[in-house]
């Protein structure tokens, strides 16, 4: 059992062609965050937010991924292929690694609402 807790936006849905914010929040620990990694369902890295070096968006996603808000990530121009799991990995000292999971469903329907509630995975 780790000291801290990762809260995430949980299961969210958004419209095809729209955008969505992926958010994780680390609480209940005094550990310092040195880096947050954002990964896609196939474990490919989307982006990194390093405490010293700032943001790095991986080339394959530069056109559709925007850093922030905060340590979160904004996905734009959503396609149906974006449906799936996303992971935030917090690298901290001295606690080690915390990992949060978000499931994004991209909907064709124009009535799809972007839901965003924080939950503990």
């Amino acid at each position: 059992m780790m000291t801290g807790t990762i809260e995430t936006t949980g299961n969210i849905s958004a419209k095809k062609g729209g955008s969505v914010i992926l958010q994780c929040h680390l609480s209940s620990t005094m550990a310092q965050v040195t880096q947050v990694n954002w990964e896609q369902h196939d474990h490919s890295l989307l982006a990194i937010r390093n405490a010293e070096l700032g943001w790095h968006i991986y080339p394959a996603f530069k056109d559709r991924v925007a850093p922030g808000p905060g340590l979160g990530l904004t996905l734009q121009s959503l396609t149906m292929n974006d449906t799936g799991e996303y992971f935030c990995t917090y690298h901290t000292y001295p606690d080690g690694t915390y990992r949060g999971r978000i499931f994004l469903e991209v909907l064709e329907s124009s009535v799809a609402e972007h839901s965003a509630r924080f939950q503990i995975p």
């Epitope: 780790m2 005094m30 040195t34 010293e52 001295p94 080690g96 690694t97």
Partner: antibody, heavy 122, light 107 residues
Framework: QLQLQESGPGLVKPAETLSLTCTVS??????????WTWIRQPPGKCLEWIGT???????FHNPSLKSRVTIPVDTSKNQFSLKLSSVTAADTAVYYC??????????????WGQGTLVTVSS | DIQMTQSPSSLSASVGDRVTITCRAS??????LNWYQQKPGKAPKLLIY???SLQSGVPSRFSGSGSGTDFTLTISSLQPEDFATYYC?????????FGCGTKVEIK
């Protein structure tokens, strides 16, 4: 197999700066999953944590050493260093570098260098 | 800072003996307690992490237990190569701190 090797002068004069380098082989210092540490052991005494660094330069150090400690990282050489300023005889110790790992909660020091003795004397 | 106190500071034992070393933290550290073995002129070697997890390659005669403030390292049947100094270390919070060691000597 990961290996760490400390190097640097074995004798430092009082009030000068102690400089040591740890060269990592068999693994990358730029690994996102690991932190890198300096620990020392004065002759016949307890182990003391000096500080820890991440590949990007984020540093955590022991407040007991105040602002005397810096831990630079050179990812191009797969090395991290220790610089301890204004040394006194009390800084005489065997200095170890170590890796923080494996990927578990609140990880321990799983790989260590063999250590290098640094004597502070005029 | 979290103080780590080991006892005894030294002990004498024979090959085949069951040996128990204790470590007490000055405040609760959950299960974030690690044990190391150090032989003269050598670097410490990780034996047990997270209070009770055996590091890869370490013989099963070594075991750890405890949580909160009180922890134990046990060697079920002491072997000739086990004569060394053993240190506990907390990785709960910075500054990281070590116990001052228990020296296991030949009786």
């Amino acid at each position: 197999q990961l290996q760490l090797q400390e190097s640097g002068p074995g004798l430092v004069k009082p009030a000068e700066t102690l400089s040591l380098t740890c060269t990592v082989s068999g693994g990358s210092i730029s690994s996102y999953d690991h932190y890198w540490t300096w620990i020392r052991q004065p002759p016949g005494k307890c182990l003391e944590w000096i500080g820890t660094v991440y590949y990007s330069g984020s540093t955590f150090h022991n407040p007991s050493l105040k602002s005397r400690v810096t831990i630079p990282v050179d990812t191009s050489k797969n090395q991290f260093s220790l610089k301890l300023s204004s040394v006194t005889a009390a800084d005489t110790a065997v200095y170890y570098c170590a890796r923080v790992g494996p990927d578990v909660s609140h990880p321990p020091f799983d790989y260590w260098g063999q250590g290098t003795l640094v004597t502070v004397s005029s | 800072d979290i103080q780590m106190t080991q006892s005894p500071s030294s002990l004498s034992a024979s090959v085949g003996d069951r040996v128990t070393i204790t470590c007490r933290a000055s405040q609760s550290i959950s299960s974030y307690l690690n044990w190391y073995q150090q032989k003269p002129g050598k670097a410490p070697k990780l034996l047990i992490y997270a209070a009770s997890s055996l590091q890869s390659g370490v013989p099963s005669r070594f075991s750890g237990s405890g949580s909160g403030t009180d922890f134990t390292l046990t060697i079920s049947s002491l072997q000739p190569e086990d004569f060394a100094t053993y240190y506990c270390q907390q990785s709960y919070s910075t500054p990281i701190t070590f116990g001052c060691g228990t020296k296991v000597e030949i009786k």
